[in-house]
């Protein structure tokens, strides 16, 4: 299980409309459910139940976003509509270029994501927990545009992002 280096860029807008970018670094792990690849895109928070809908909307998602899913305690969802792996698969089907799971409340999900799959996803499936997960969710819960870059080696430069 390799370390995933995640850089999150937050676009902070001032009342005048100017904006600055803030970069936060955190680490997670690449799970065996997906590929150990770099990926980047805008962060879109997805509720675990939001991944249950199986309808015609699935092909309507544009490619290239990074899905962030905070998993709930297993007791709160005793009969999940999909396994954690199934949720990752559904997000990728919908166009996610990567999926990041916050497993702090559901550490058992780590084993589910790391069970050797004969057909792993072609996109990275990363899990975060503890302080890194708190950092990530604090960013995701802000009313800001945020972008994630996932790398499988430490970033060379902390701000390789666009000049806005």
């Amino acid at each position: 299980k390799e370390t995933a280096f995640v850089e999150v860029v937050l676009f902070e807008s001032s009342p005048s409309g100017d904006y600055t970018t803030y970069t936060t670094g955190l680490t997670g792990r690449f799970s065996r459910a997906g590929a150990t690849l770099s990926a980047e895109g805008e962060i879109v928070q997805m509720h675990p139940l939001g991944l249950c809908n199986n309808n015609d909307e699935e092909d309507l998602y544009e490619y290239g976003w990074v899905g962030v899913v905070k998993l709930e305690q297993p007791e709160l969802d005793p009969k999940p509509c999909l396994t954690v792996l199934g949720k990752a698969k559904r997000a990728v089907q919908r166009g996610a270029t990567a999926v990041i799971f916050d497993v702090s409340e559901n550490p058992e999900a780590i084993d589910q994501l790391n069970q050797g799959s004969e057909d792993p996803l072609k996109r990275p499936v990363v899990y975060v927990k503890g302080a890194d997960a708190i950092k990530l969710m604090n960013i995701v819960n802000k009313q800001k545009v945020a972008r994630a870059r996932i790398q499988h080696r430490p970033p060379r430069q902390p701000t390789e992002y666009f000049d806005m």
């Epitope: 676009f11 770099s38 490619y63 972008r147």
Partner: antibody
Framework: EVQLVESGGGLVPPGKSLKLSCSAS????????MHWIRQAPGKGLDWVGY???????IYADAVKGRFTISRDNAKNTLYLLINSLKSEDTAMYYC???????????WGQGVMVTVSS | DIVMTQSPFSLAVSEGDMVTIMCRSS????????????LAWYQQKPGQSPKLLIY???TRQSGVPDRFIGSGSGTDFTLTISDVQAEDLADYYC????????FGSGTKLEIK
């Protein structure tokens, strides 16, 4: 079927404000970022600004401070408030679906705003 | 902001001809994170809203005829229309969405 329908345009005197709406249907609106793009008569396309699924906003330099993009996910509606209208704001305004660093696959039919006394 | 330089401004061709429209960006649009070029091509017919033709520089949007071909990487991109049809009469725009989005100035395609 994805549909985006703009409304609220018309003839407005300079200096006034106007609020455009874009009603969305056929997709989970709350999961999407949305853009406003405008096109002055006989001219090219100009990006105006963006609102993320969680209501973060980014604007083009030309409109900063005067334009405000908002959304009401419960009503599946995107808004563009234009303050202190100028003649150069005369354009067809389109809403389009897509993430900030994404392309726009779906566009509305556009709504015309004419600023003139 | 990234500047998109599109050429030519207009061109008139006969049905069956091949057309090439160029777009050059002031900086690379190739993402090191996913190796995709953040460039799209749009067609806008008179009185209509723009329609997506090509995304990621070379991927044709579903339903778009295969005579529309996008190519290029980094800073130089091309839209080629082979076997031009009367219904291709339109304005064509490139869009960079690597950072704050910017469109090319547009190319007006006229049929002789």
């Amino acid at each position: 079927e994805v549909q985006l329908v703009e409304s609220g345009g018309g003839l407005v005197p300079p200096g006034k404000s106007l609020k455009l709406s874009c009603s969305a249907s056929g997709f989970p609106f709350s999961n999407y970022g949305m853009h406003w793009i405008r096109q002055a008569p006989g001219k090219g396309l100009d990006w105006v600004g963006y609102i993320s699924s969680n209501s973060g906003t980014i604007y083009a330099d030309a409109v900063k401070g005067r334009f405000t993009i908002s959304r009401d996910n419960a009503k599946n509606t995107l808004y563009l408030l234009i303050n202190s209208l100028k003649s150069e704001d005369t354009a067809m305004y389109y809403c389009a679906r897509g993430y900030f660093d994404g392309y726009y696959r779906f566009w509305g039919q556009g709504v015309m705003v004419t600023v003139s006394s | 902001d990234i500047v998109m330089t599109q050429s030519p401004f207009s061109l008139a061709v006969s049905e069956g001809d091949m057309v090439t429209i160029m777009c050059r960006s002031s900086q690379s649009l190739l993402s090191s994170g996913n190796q995709k070029n953040y460039l799209a091509w749009y067609q806008q017919k008179p009185g209509q809203s723009p329609k997506l033709l090509i995304y990621h520089a070379s991927t044709r949007q579903s339903g778009v005829p295969d005579r529309f071909i996008g190519s290029g990487s980094g800073t130089d991109f091309t839209l080629t229309i082979s076997d031009v049809q009367a219904e291709d009469l339109a304005d064509y725009y490139c869009l960079q969405h690597y950072s704050s989005p910017t469109f090319g100035s547009g190319t007006k395609l006229e049929i002789k």
